[in-house]
């Protein structure tokens, strides 16, 4: 008789637990900034406080009747769902309620950043254990929403946004396009894409993962032991800003890049069907299901790894596309990706400080996108060796010549325009191990990384008939931190991580031109973290 | 994550030749205005002034004087509804969207939003 | 078919703490689709909800009586408890124990009170 | 609190007649109420539930209406076992009761 949400998101080894820190009181406090609440209901009252915060738009309509238990509705049953007795995630945490929506569900970007001001200053006066906010809330895209979830995030609170309901790229809304905050798609009983209406949940690179969010039972402000269920992006936020409540109780010293990483890792993979979003999207769309993940006691020092795309470079001859990490993670490779095939590579760079991905286009490409890999290694030191484009005929090598580093990912940058001139770059992991080798025209980058029991090694996969995607994957107990097209003759669109799983994509056109000979190879780094062991290359 | 997709920023380098203040015109506004690029969410007539990171607080209200003091000038009135510190340095401005390019060109503006809806999800 | 059965002292002194037991019978009390009430009825009066609990030990109090009492649930038993202190001679009446059902579970049915005990009546004298 | 007041505090009617009970809210209580029957020795019965519905095996005669602050529970045709004590409860706001009506044999 559990809801089907709470059934999909806590797996049965959680069901008994209690939502307690060890000293028997959950430290976690979650600030939702929604409608006002009815905090008499049976499933918060006494562990919610309504803050005096109220900054709102007056309603539109002359006719409009302020009505209480209408007022009170969405934010009322999100918090049910975040803390609720018998419907919520996070059963024991307590929540502070900001007013910045209206009755009618509409507020300001200015209300909601005086809200996180609010929440700023209430920190700085009284400093507390773990903060959560829940955003339940989207707007257009706004540069000053997005900057100040980044300046709240990096204080050390904890930021979750819905993705919106509006069926379009989440990168478009904010605060669900600032990087720092989790962004949460939802999803239905079925896992699939959760259609509202005409609309439904967004999509796109800017999403984190998805959560239950479709005909979700919660606390009704009709009355104070009333249930309803409602649906959006805002109900599976309030799941994941329970989760994350959860994970801080157990563990309150977890930080914002650990904890992404960990919902990621843990999530269900690969149960949304793709087709619902729109072609050109379904590859920036991570195909993941939020469910609580085990503490990190029991899960060891396992190697996170998190693919990051960037925004597309637009079509112009010299785009560039940029992908960032989180300041906590490493870079660790960095590969792009074309549609029309048309792009002059990827490398790494420092920028201010932090490594970056960056692709180029080519001249007639439609755009390209950077692919970093973002892995979370504890005390990592990560250096990138580059060589310069060899002259004609003669191979590019690049290994990690310090001691004790790894190789893992290897980055290639064409200098020529001309895609039929210029042999393609190559991984070869039995020749030379550890090494990225290119090719005529290319610039070699290797990403080389030395951390307490880190070991890398290279696995690739050829096909050599017509095939639009190649896939290699690592096997349990390693971690993919680099994927690589290695082609014979033909034009490739690049590569990507899915997961676990490197894809090298090939252009449609060049299958039907391709001989036996020249195989496409998908070559992926797959490395593993054994604190007791020392950094190695394994063969 | 954070590049600015479907969005308008509009470059208001306006010259100043209504007032032949030395700062004023010795300073050329490299800020930018932007605003919500779904018409129907915007909010003229409210304004999100964000200043540079490293502004001081006492900056801060002085440069929400000096706007209110130049607009009065003009013989326009602009409310301050609100001054950020702990966040962003910055001010929340109710004023007519005539004053835009000289709010631009005040020192320490990074760049101007417009207030904009945010909607239940 | 479920049966609730209280049982406890009939007779309390003032200012002392009154102690009840609702024992659940024909069905289990570990189900999210209740919660467990306690109700009194003083004599010649009208009724008055005490409290509620599930089989969690989540509990709701009637805010008039919240800093009095506590309910405590023990599933192994299939019981709920009722303690009420500081007890005066207003506290005098009939105890019921009851089912609520939780509006959780729609299935379950509409959120009202029953079955009820057929209740007991606690006197506070010296 | 809301608080319910019933009317009248006594209806004394004949078998076959019908009776009609009042409760009237302090606050809207929207259709959170319910009507119980209470018979003496015993605990009280569940009779109505959200204003209008029948809770199960309760006689057709058995019918209640309203909605905000105003309820009526209607017995169309009394029948000797209906004579009791009549209780509202609203569950708006946590759970309250009426006073009661007692309705008794004429």
């Known amino acids: 008789s559990i809801p089907w949400n709470l059934e999909r998101i806590i797996p049965a080894w959680h069901q008994t637990e209690e939502d307690r820190s060890p000293d028997g009181s959950s430290q976690v406090e979650v600030y939702l900034l929604d409608t006002s609440i009815q905090g008499a209901h049976r499933e918060i009252e006494g562990r919610v406080t309504i803050t005096d915060f109220n900054s709102v738009p007056e309603e539109d309509g002359t006719r409009f009747h302020r009505q209480a238990s209408k007022c009170d509705s969405h934010g009322t049953h999100l918090a049910g769902v975040v803390s609720g007795r018998d419907a919520g995630v996070a059963k024991g945490t307590s929540l502070h309620s900001l007013r910045v929506l209206n009755c009618q569900g509409k507020g300001t970007v200015s209300g909601t950043l005086i809200g996180l001001e609010f929440i700023r200053k209430s920190q700085l006066i009284q400093p507390s254990g773990p903060l959560v906010v829940l955003l339940p809330l989207a707007g257009g895209y706004s540069r000053i929403l997005n900057a100040a979830c980044r300046h709240l995030a990096r204080t050390g609170v904890v930021l979750v946004a819905a993705a919106g309901n509006f069926r379009d790229d989440a990168c478009l809304y904010s605060p669900a396009s600032a990087p720092e905050v989790i962004t949460v798609g939802a999803t239905n009983a079925q896992d699939q894409p959760v259609t509202l209406g005409t609309l439904g949940t967004n999509f796109g690179r800017c999403v984190d993962l998805f959560a239950p969010g479709k005909d979700i039972i919660g606390a009704s402000s009709d009355c104070s032991t009333c249930f309803m269920s409602q649906s959006g992006t805002s109900q599976a936020a309030a799941h994941v800003a329970g989760i994350v409540a959860r994970m801080l109780s157990r563990e309150p010293t977890l930080t914002l890049a650990e904890l992404r990483q960990r919902l990621i890792h843990f999530s269900t993979k690969d149960v949304i069907n793709m087709a619902w979003f729109p072609e050109d999207q379904q590859v920036l769309t991570p195909n993941l299901v939020a469910t609580l993940p085990p503490s990190t006691h029991e899960t060891g020092g396992q190697l996170l790894c998190r693919t990051v795309w960037s925004a597309h470079s637009g079509p112009t001859r010299t785009a560039t596309a940029t992908a960032r990490c989180a300041p906590e993670e490493e870079l660790l490779s960095c590969s792009s990706f074309s549609r029309s095939g048309r792009r002059r590579g990827d490398w790494i760079e420092a920028i201010g400080g932090q490594q970056v991905c960056k692709a180029l286009n080519a001249f007639g490409g439609e755009g390209v996108y950077a692919v970093a890999r973002c892995c979370l290694v504890p005390r990592a030191n990560c250096s990138i060796h580059n060589t310069p484009a060899a002259r004609a005929g003669l191979e590019t090598h690049v290994h990690c010549h310090q001691k004790d580093h790894v190789l893992t990912g290897c980055s290639f940058h064409w200098e020529v325009e001309d895609l039929s001139v210029r042999r393609q770059p190559a991984l070869r992991s039995r020749r030379q191990p550890g090494q990225c080798v290119g090719h005529q025209a290319a610039s070699v980058y290797a990403s080389c990384c030395h951390a307490p029991g880190l070991e890398c090694k290279i696995k690739e996969h050829g096909i050599s008939g017509p095939s639009e995607q190649v896939t290699v994957a690592c096997e349990a107990g390693w971690t993919l931190t680099g994927c690589n097209v290695l082609p014979g003759a033909s034009l490739t669109l690049g590569a990507y991580s899915v997961d676990n799983l490197c894809v090298a994509r090939v252009h449609d056109t060049a299958r039907a031109d391709r001989t036996s000979g020249e195989a496409t190879v998908a070559a992926a780094i797959c490395c593993r973290s054994r604190p007791s062991a020392k950094a190695s290359w394994v063969q | 994550q954070d590049e600015d997709g479907d969005y308008e920023e509009l470059m208001l380098a306006l010259p100043s030749q209504e007032d032949g203040l030395a700062d004023e015109a010795a300073h050329v506004a490299t800020a930018t205005f932007r605003r919500c690029s779904k018409e129907a969410w915007r909010l003229p007539g409210t304004y999100i002034v964000v200043l540079m990171e490293e502004t001081q607080r006492l900056q801060i209200e002085q440069t929400a004087h000096r706007l209110q003091t130049r607009a009065a000038r003009r013989g326009y009135v602009i409310k301050v509804l609100h001054i950020f510190y702990d966040l962003f340095p910055g001010f929340l401005v109710k004023m007519s969207s005539d004053l835009l390019g000289l709010a631009l060109k005040l020192p320490h503006v990074e760049y101007i939003e417009e207030d904009s809806f945010v909607f239940a999800q | 078919q479920l049966q609730l059965q209280e049982s406890g002292p009939g007779l309390v002194k003032p200012s002392e703490t009154l102690s009840l037991t609702c024992t659940v019978s024909?069905?289990?009390?570990?189900?999210?689709?209740?919660?467990w009430a306690w109700i009194r009825q003083p004599p010649g009066k009208g009724l008055e909800w005490i409290g509620s609990?599930?089989?969690?030990?989540?509990?709701y109090y009637n805010p008039s009586l919240k800093s009095r009492v506590t309910i405590s649930v023990d599933t192994s038993k299939n019981q709920f408890s009722l303690k009420l202190s500081s007890v005066t001679a207003a506290d005098t009446a009939v105890y019921y124990c009851?089912?609520?059902?939780?509006?959780?579970?729609?299935?379950?049915?509409?959120?009202?009170?029953?079955?009820w005990g057929q209740g007991t009546l606690v006197t506070v004298s010296s | 609190e809301i608080v319910l007041t019933q009317s009248p505090a006594t209806l004394s009617l004949s078998p076959g007649e019908r009776a009609t009970l009042s409760c009237r809210a302090s606050?809207?209580?929207?259709?959170?109420l319910a009507w119980y029957q209470q018979k003496p020795g015993q605990a009280p019965r569940l009779l109505i539930y959200?204003?209008?519905n029948r809770a199960t095996g309760i006689p057709a005669r058995f019918s209640g209406s309203g909605s905000g602050t105003d309820f009526t529970l209607t017995i169309s045709s009394l029948e000797p076992e209906d004579f009791a004590v009549y209780y509202c409860?609203?569950?708006?706001?946590?759970?309250?009761f009426g006073g009661g009506t007692k309705v008794e044999i004429k």
């Open positions: 009851a089912r609520e059902n939780s509006g959780v579970v729609p299935a379950a049915g509409p959120n009202w009170f029953g079955p």
């Open positions: 409860q609203q569950r708006r706001n946590w759970f309250t």
């Open positions: 024909g069905g289990s009390i570990v189900s999210s689709s209740y919660y």
């Open positions: 959200d204003a209008s």
């Open positions: 609990i599930n089989y969690k030990g989540s509990t």
């Open positions: 606050q809207s209580v929207s259709s959170y």
